[in-house]
């Protein structure tokens, strides 16, 4: 059949070139005796101007002349023309005829329509509707330029080069013309939001189109974020945990919470826990989920900070028995823990472990226990438990004393350690008088209290017969035990008033009570210090102005016609006082410690009073020791050279300096003080800190040479100084020099020498040293 | 040589529109993407969008969607853009600058329009 | 939005001093598509640095740039006075494109 195929329409870009595919066909019966004519026309319609010509090309209209070119090869049926230099008036329809002989001519009516603009028309990306991760897709750009002559090129930009893979394909048929660029790329999350460019150059024209990429992905990125971090927390506290999401396309559709792999309700973001408690710790996980997947987080330990103690065994604990306690921590405790263990508030020592073993437990193990954890951020105590190691009463403490309250009252005090508590009873001569139970023999004068493990007697209207042998028994479950007294109901009682501890002056009455009823021969020994200090017929001893002489330990008895009554117990009276003027003593040790030693100077300050006395030593204004605070032993004054030492004791501070300066001589002070007065002696130190020295010998002939020099243990050493000379103890010279020199040696130097610095207020005058002159006899 | 030309300065009251400019000069205008951007006094760069003079599609900053509108005019190489509904807050220099495709670097910027809302 | 923070916001540097300021997004930035920019007082940005640490025509050699991912840095070696400026990172690895807050370099 007869007819011409190429496509329906062809773009160019000006100044561009564009091909026209185009094939044709006559039947097979048809002779070819001279070829075939193949000819292109524009506006076929219209002007039908001559684009290409075979046979005739001065047939083609001067516009298309030397810008078109017939591809083809009608041999071959085909018939494509190629437009160069391409001008928007090129626009237009393009029609192909083909003639083999005056009867054998074929017109394509239908023709080509060629569009040609100034600018390139932007190339047309194809994307996937859904872009997933992990699948590969394909974007096409294309465009419907086609230029064989020059490169007509376009390029992919944006793309990930280690995850994508370009190439090009033509497409140049009768049917269509046009261009495709496919970038292959493997789709990644991190994809999403990635800018793809594909670019078209044509001529010197460029075009460019984008797409947004929206990839859809799993979530990344899940993690947990807890606070307060970096610190421990504690029970009751504030607790947060966020499910953190990197990223996530589309948006998180829902969050899961796991604790210890136990699914919680909470669906929100946040995980609050208001008051942190020991349940609350453990492993926790989130998991975040969206359309496309889902991710748990790395799991996240939450440790509550806290102990709790548990006892074993949990019942009764007997002697003997091992008793284990343990410092249990909530689930998750960091590895890092450090324990300890308290018993009644005190650090047991060397007790570090999470166990305390109580290994054959005796009653010292009852008490409360507490452990504490600690790490790098802190440390927390557990609440206490309390430990009770059972047995059976200790041998029970029974004392017994008199109290004056209308007349003498006799007590008797018994009292016992035991677990369980125990049964006591306080007899006399077979009969009870008192139990912690409530039996008593019961008598008006005797009344019974009790607590536990305590019982008190009082017996009034004490007579004779009330003393002798008490008895104090305790019983429980697992024992018994007893305790006796000798009672004497006529012992003595002495009182102080108006107290026991007086200032001196102040006006005290000893008072001498008995058990018995007074009679009016009676008669009253006082001791003082156990000595015998008064005796006569008053109950009372008047001291009217006590003094430091009258303080000490007394003790009365009371005497009638037929019987004594017991001593009393001592009482002791303290008279208080200010300081006595302070005893101050100074002197110099030379070569203490044997040869070379040097020097020590000692000062040494007592003082006599109650309370003790603040003693504090100064030197021109300076305090140079001070007894405070208190406390024995020595040590080297705060701020004072290296060289003194300090010793302290109650009443007495004594100052040692090692090689003395100069500066550290003259009048000290020593100052005592207490609350009630103060006094104050002063000394005078000379530390032989200025040394005279005559060379070479202190003995020299008449006419030698003499060297006195005045050597001066100083601070300011080196720096310049005046120095007094005396000779015979009067005045001899004076200057800038610490060197004198006699030259020559004469009879009438002989003399006693001493030197002293000026510099210094209240420099010591060295010892004097005696110039000997040997001399021959006189003629 | 390239150049991206802009007006010194546009006095606007509140609630007024305005359309900038920026001719382009020195090169093929429709082979380059024009961009805009925002500098407020003694603050950084925001970019406001751009526009594709060949095909006129258009990018915005979601921050400015209802802000601006960008055009162009091929014929005289000039990028527009206009802002509506003046305030205060939209004093600023506003300056165009093409991108290189290759690199997507603005590499010419032009000399920037102060505007200045006031009444 | 990818958002871009430099540090320090000013520095002061003698002539002759080497500084390094920096440039952090909160999302990963294509170093392809990272670019630096000066601006002088009252004066337009000028293209300084692109693709992360390509110098733009003109710019001394003293100047260069690196970094990947979402750290990036510009270091001048050798502080001169015409240095003084406003520089700012830009990313167009996603949209919005973003810039910079800016590091303003003084000269003692």
């Known amino acids: 059949s007869w007819g011409v195929s190429s496509p329906q329409d062809v773009q160019g870009v000006k100044g561009s070139c564009l091909l026209i595919p185009c094939i044709f066909s006559f039947p097979a019966d048809v002779e070819v005796p001279d070829g075939i004519t193949a000819i292109w026309y524009y506006d076929y319609s219209g002007q039908r101007q001559v684009v290409s010509h075979s046979a005739d090309p001065k047939l083609v209209e001067a516009r298309f002349r030397g810008r078109t070119e017939f591809m083809g090869n009608p041999e071959h049926r085909v018939c494509n023309l190629l437009l160069k230099d391409l001008q928007p008036e090129d626009s237009g329809s393009y029609n192909f005829r083909f003639e083999i002989s005056e009867v054998n001519r074929w017109s394509d009516v239908k023709g080509t329509l060629v569009t040609v603009t100034e600018e390139p028309r932007v190339p047309t990306i194809a994307s996937p509707v859904e872009l997933l991760e992990g699948t590969e897709v394909d974007f096409n750009c294309s465009t419907p330029y086609v230029c064989l002559q020059e490169q007509v090129r376009l390029q992919w930009q944006g793309q990930d080069p280690a995850r994508s893979v370009t190439f090009n394909s033509q497409k140049f048929e009768p049917t269509g013309v046009g261009h495709l660029e496919t970038l292959h790329m493997a789709m990644s999350w991190q994809d999403h939001g990635r800018i793809l460019r594909c670019q078209l150059s044509v001529a010197n024209h460029r075009a460019q189109s984008e797409i947004h990429l929206q990839v859809k992905y799993a979530p990344k990125g899940v993690k947990i974020l807890l606070s307060p971090s970096g610190r421990n927390i504690l029970p009751g506290e504030l607790v947060t945990l966020t499910c953190q999401v990197n990223s996530s396309y589309p948006a998180v559709s829902s969050i899961k919470w796991l604790k210890d792999g136990v699914r919680l309700q909470t669906k929100t973001g946040v995980l609050h826990l208001p008051q942190a408690a020991w349940s609350d710790a453990g492993v926790y996980t989130c998991q975040a989920e969206n359309g496309v997947g889902s991710l748990v987080s790395p799991p996240i330990s939450l440790h509550i900070f806290m102990a709790e103690v548990q006892v074993s065994p949990a019942g009764p604990i007997l002697e003997n028995q091992t008793v284990t306690l343990v410092c249990n921590t909530p689930n998750e405790a960091p590895s890092d823990l450090r324990y300890s263990w308290y018993k009644n508030h005190v650090l047991l020592e060397d007790a570090h472990s999470h166990t305390l073993r109580l290994h054959l437990a005796t009653r010292a193990d009852t008490g409360f226990y507490f452990c504490e954890v600690q790490n790098v951020h802190g440390s927390e105590r557990s609440g206490p438990v309390s430990v009770v190691v059972n047995h059976p009463p200790l041998t029970p403490v029974l004392t017994a004393f008199l109290e004056t309250q209308a007349g003498l009252v006799g007590i008797l005090h018994c009292s016992v350690v035991s677990e369980p508590l125990a049964t006591l009873v306080l007899s006399h001569g077979g009969h009870i008088l008192a139990s912690t139970s409530g039996d008593s023999d019961h008598s008006p004068r005797f009344s019974g209290t009790s607590g536990p493990n305590s019982l008190r007697l009082e017996i009034r209207d004490l007579e004779e017969t009330d003393s002798g042998e008490y008895k104090c028994s305790a019983t429980n479950s697992l024992g018994n035990a007893t305790s006796t007294l000798d009672f004497h109901a006529n012992a003595a009682r002495l009182l102080i008033s108006p107290a026991a501890e007086v200032v001196e002056g102040q006006a005290v009455t000893l008072s001498c009570r008995s058990g018995l009823s007074p009679t009016p021969d009676a008669r009253f020994s006082w001791y003082l210090n156990g000595a015998l200090l008064h005796e006569g017929p008053g109950s009372s001893l008047l001291l009217p102005a006590a003094s430091s002489t009258d303080a000490g330990s007394y003790h009365c008895r009371a005497r009638d016609g037929h019987s004594a009554s017991g001593p009393s117990s001592p009482a002791v009276l303290t008279v208080l006082y200010p300081p006595r003027q302070p005893t101050f003593t100074t002197r110099l040790d030379l070569d203490a410690a044997g040869a070379g030693a040097g020097r020590r100077g000692l000062l040494l300050c007592r003082v006599d009073s109650d309370p003790p006395a603040r003693l504090q030593l100064l030197h021109k204004d300076r305090v140079v020791a001070t007894s405070l605070p208190s406390g024995g032993g020595c040590s080297t004054c705060g701020g004072c050279s290296p060289r003194m030492k300090v010793t302290k004791a109650p009443n007495l501070l004594r100052v040692e300096i090692h090689n003395p300066l100069l500066e550290e001589e003259g009048l000290y002070l020593c100052e005592a003080s207490n609350a009630l007065g103060n006094a104050s002696t002063s000394a005078t130190f000379n530390g032989q800190a200025t040394v005279l020295a005559i060379a070479p010998s202190h003995t020299l002939q008449e006419g030698t040479e003499a060297n006195l020099t005045c050597n001066v243990s100083r601070e300011a050493a080196g720096s310049p100084a005046n120095f007094s000379w005396f000779r015979n103890g009067v005045l001899w010279a004076q200057g800038p020099l610490e060197t004198v020199t006699l030259l020559p040696v004469a009879r009438t130097d002989a003399a006693l020498y001493a030197c002293r610095i000026l510099t210094e207020a209240g420099a010591q005058l060295s010892t004097p040293v005696l110039l000997s002159v040997l001399y021959p006899p006189d003629r | 040589q390239v150049q991206l030309q802009q007006p010194g300065a546009e006095l606007v009251k509140p609630g007024a529109s305005v359309k900038l400019s920026c001719m382009a000069s020195g090169y093929i205008f429709t082979n380059y993407w024009m961009h805009w951007v925002k500098q407020r006094p003694g603050r950084g760069l925001e970019w406001i969008g751009r526009?594709?003079?060949?095909?006129?599609?258009?990018k915005y900053n979601d921050n400015f969607k209802n802000k601006a509108t960008l055009t162009v005019d091929k014929s005289s190489k000039t990028s527009y853009m206009q802002l509506n509904s003046l305030t205060s807050a939209d004093s600023a220099v506003y300056f165009c600058?093409?991108?290189?495709?290759?690199?997507?670097?603005?590499?010419?910027w032009g000399t920037g329009t102060t505007v200045t809302v006031s009444s | 939005e990818n958002v871009l923070t430099q540090s320090p916001a000013i520095m002061s540097a003698s002539p002759g001093e080497k500084i390094t300021m920096t440039c952090r997004a909160t999302s990963s930035v294509s170093s392809s598509y990272l670019h630096w920019f000066q601006q002088k007082s009252g004066a337009s940005p000028k293209p300084w640095i692109y693709?992360?640490?390509n110098l733009a025509s003109g710019v001394p050699a003293r100047f260069s740039g690196s970094g990947s991912g979402t750290s990036y840095s510009l270091t001048i070696s050798s502080v001169e006075a015409e240095d003084a400026a406003t520089y700012y990172c830009q990313q167009y690895s996603g949209y919005p494109l973003t810039f910079g807050g800016g590091t303003k370099v003084e000269i003692k």
């Open positions: 693709s992360t640490s």
């Open positions: 526009i594709d003079p060949n095909s006129a599609g258009t």
């Open positions: 600058a093409r991108e290189d495709f290759d690199s997507r670097n603005f590499d010419v």
